[in-house]
Amino acid sequence: FSPLRRISIKILVHSLFSMLIMCTILTNCIFMTMNNPPDWTKNVEYTFTGIYTFESLVKILARGFCVGEFTFLRDPWNWLDFVVIVFAYLTEFVNLGNVSALRTFRVLRALKTISVIPGLKTIVGALIQSVKKLSDVMILTVFCLSVFALIGLQLFMGNLKHKCFRNSLENNETLESIMNTLESEEDFRKYFYYLEGSKDALLCGFSTDSGQCPEGYTCVKIGRNPDYGYTSFDTFSWAFLALFRLMTQDYWENLYQQTLRAAGKTYMIFFVVVIFLGSFYLINLILAVVAMAYEEQNQ
């Protein structure tokens, strides 16, 4: 080993070196949080870039660059360091059009903390391992969601467009002519029934156990779906999104109430099955796989 390499190895394995890098990263993160940084922070920025460059040079000299098994670029954690340095020099010395977009990559410096703190390294390692192990569970989840999305599509397609429409039409008004003239929410409220505080017209259905319209209103299927058109089972993709929402229990009770009002209370069976299978079983299966991967990584 050349004297330069010996010195590099000594520096690399020294605990103070790790402490220096960790402090640099944390200080850099503090500086990045500044809203309107003063001019002198520019020099501090150069100092940080210098320290990171020095760290990488030490690692390269100690371990080699890329030829060989334990060299600098063979460790994925060093890829991050390499990218950080490359972007630091790019944003500083190369005149690129949209520099602010490239400056976003400075945030990657915060991720360097992971490679320095051993506990964090374990957690992130477990996370990466779990993603690999999750592939089978993800396939199962997507398959189950797809099956139920197709069932939902068949059962509820178009149902969430049902609305309570005012009976007293003018002599020459038709549904079509009204829908063409409706622009503001006030216009809609003139013809459709809205519950107090609701942003969507009251849903209704044509089956006996679905929601009925109040006196003076008839159930019609027209206009857009609730929640600005984002809640529906009209296409496979929207149905899939609705099922994903059920699985993650993201305000699912609203979707449940809307669908039951439009389709009928019998369909609660569909929601019971989806919640039990998707929300209770699949979510916990995912958690189990993550827990297993973390346990393996710890060992």
Epitope: M157, G158, K161, F165, N167, T174, L175, E176, F206, Q212, C213, E215, G216, T218, C219, V220, K221, I222
Partner: nanobody, 120 residues
Framework: EVQLVESGGGVVQPGGSLRLSCAAS????????MAWYRQAPGKQRELVAY??????ISYADSVKGRFTISRDASKRVYLQMNSLRPEDTALYYC???????????????WGQGTLVTVSS
């Protein structure tokens, strides 16, 4: 294609009665509101009466107490016209808000009209 077919029109003497009927032909998933309109010569079309699936019924002031609208479980609506007057002479149209199939939106459908003439 859905069509509304009216029948029952004709010539009747003042004070007489007529029963108009309107049936929806073709594929119908759901009929919402069914109504009768009329258009007298040289006048605008006006609403006579309507009936909703929930049983809401409304009549024009000029026909209240004389005309009765009803609908049956099939795709039919009726207008029973009693104590007819010369001013009831008009072309009577049937109109329905209906869904041809479960995937289509509700639309407005009109019949071709049936002529009712009240004269002595």
């Amino acid at each position: 294609e859905v069509q509304l077919v009216e029948s029952g029109g004709g010539v009747v003497q003042p004070g007489g009665s007529l029963r108009l009927s309107c049936a929806a032909s073709g594929p119908v998933f759901n009929i919402n509101r069914m109504a009768w309109y009329r258009q007298a010569p040289g006048k605008q079309r006006e609403l006579v009466a309507y009936v909703t699936p929930t049983g809401d019924i409304s009549y024009a002031d000029s026909v209240k107490g004389r005309f009765t609208i009803s609908r049956d479980a099939s795709k039919r609506v009726y207008l029973q016209m009693n104590s007819l007057r010369p001013e009831d002479t008009a072309l009577y149209y049937c109109r329905a808000l209906l869904q041809p199939d479960r995937y289509s939106n509700t639309r407005t459908y009109w019949g071709q009209g049936t002529l009712v003439t009240v004269s002595s």
